[in-house]
């Protein structure tokens, strides 16, 4: 999917309202020394994409995070303010309800969730390498695209 | 817990060069962004500028192009602010501050270092 | 650069008194700005995120409102501790900006 037309604002309005406070509940009782974000992103659609597939794509060590409170916010979020969004994701929520049931929090989640973090606040505030001009967000009317 | 310990105040001459350091602990060094803001006596926040401690990205002031360049270095968790060709106009407070969880505040500052620039 | 206009520049404000000041933006920055605290010889703390979010063991005593151009920053009720400089601050384009910053004083 292509995440160049949604809503970013809306998207940042929905994860500073909840998503953020239960990605905080999930992680509570991990060290912040303990990992070190290794997923980056360098635009907020690229910080979607990368967001999406920590999110719902289970991984080696980490298979359930997709039903997750945070998670299911996440997608909400990206099907309300994402146009199309959506209908791409029918084959992923089969998929889904195939994985795991029991939710299981792993050190290899931890680790992910944390990495989710970064890449969100990324999302928030994009920090772009200067050609010029110096902005950093998208217009409100959120169909400006940011050039490199 | 979270610090930011910034080096001594300096005293320095005009036209030379000083470069202060912003030592972070308590956090994962690489995960977030560190900011640079400065203060005038009696004045307001001016921001200077950003790094991201990971890859080394940065982001300018306009008005501080130039003067400042920002550094950081992972193995022993410290950012730099260096500023060149100094004036009278510099003799502020410089403050370094991490980003919040968010990205979207500054939670944390260091607890700023005084730079004179004086002949 | 977006200006961020900020009044007063100065209250003179008694123990108990609600404390409203105002921050405007010279374009909108959507909902990205924060309120800081900053005491005599001290660093800035923060105290409001993204307008109206308080930043963790933050009082609810401020309180952040607004939205696009003009927002609004109150101290339901002042108590000595907050006799301090204000900050706004936007964070919706850089370079970042801040307001001038409103210092509360005694009567």
């Known amino acids: 999917y292509d995440f160049t037309n949604c809503d970013f604002e809306k998207i940042k309005a929905a994860y500073l309202s909840t998503i953020s406070k239960d990605l905080i509940t999930y992680m509570s009782g991990t060290k912040s020394t303990e990992f070190n974000n290794t997923v980056s992103c360098s635009n907020r659609p690229h910080c979607l994409t990368e967001i999406q597939s920590l999110t719902f794509n289970p991984t080696a060590g980490c298979a359930s995070l997709a039903k997750e409170m945070f998670a299911m916010k996440t997608k909400a979020a990206l099907a309300i303010w994402c146009p199309g969004y959506s209908e791409t994701q029918i084959n992923a929520t089969q998929a889904m309800k195939k994985a795991r049931k029991s939710k299981v929090t792993t050190n290899k989640c931890l680790e992910q969730v944390s990495q989710l973090q970064g890449l969100w606040r990324r999302f928030n505030r994009p920090l772009l390498k200067q050609q010029g001009s110096s902005d950093y967000k998208d217009d409100d009317d959120k169909h400006h695209h940011h050039h490199h | 817990q979270v610090q930011l310990q910034q080096s001594g105040a300096e005293l320095v001459r005009p036209g030379t060069s000083v470069k202060v350091s912003c030592k972070a602990s308590g956090y994962a060094f690489t995960n977030y962004l560190i900011e640079w803001v400065k203060q005038r006596p009696g004045q307001g926040l001016e921001w200077i500028g950003v790094i991201d401690p990971g890859n080394g990205d940065t982001n300018y002031n306009e008005n501080f192009k130039g003067k400042a360049t920002l550094t950081a270095d992972k193995s022993s968790s410290t950012a730099y602010i260096e500023l060149s060709r100094l004036t009278s106009e510099d003799s502020a407070v410089y403050f370094c501050?991490?980003?919040?969880?968010?990205?979207?505040?500054?939670?944390?500052w260091g607890q700023g270092t005084t730079l004179t620039v004086s002949s | 650069s977006i200006v961020m206009t900020q009044t007063p520049k100065f209250l003179l404000v008694s123990a108990g008194d609600r404390v409203t000041i105002s921050c405007k933006a010279s374009q909108s920055v959507s909902s990205d700005v924060t309120w800081y605290q900053q005491k005599p010889g001290q660093s800035p703390k923060l105290l409001i995120y993204y307008v109206s979010n308080h930043y963790t063991g933050v009082p609810d005593r401020f309180t952040g409102s607004g939205y696009g151009t003009d927002f609004t920053f109150t101290i339901s009720s002042v108590q000595a501790e907050d006799l301090a400089v204000y900050f706004c601050?936007?964070?919706?384009?850089?370079?970042?900006?801040f307001g001038a910053g409103t210092k509360l004083e005694l009567k």
């Open positions: 501050a991490r980003e919040d969880n968010t990205g979207t505040a500054f939670d944390y």
């Open positions: 601050q936007q964070h919706h384009r850089f370079p970042l900006t």
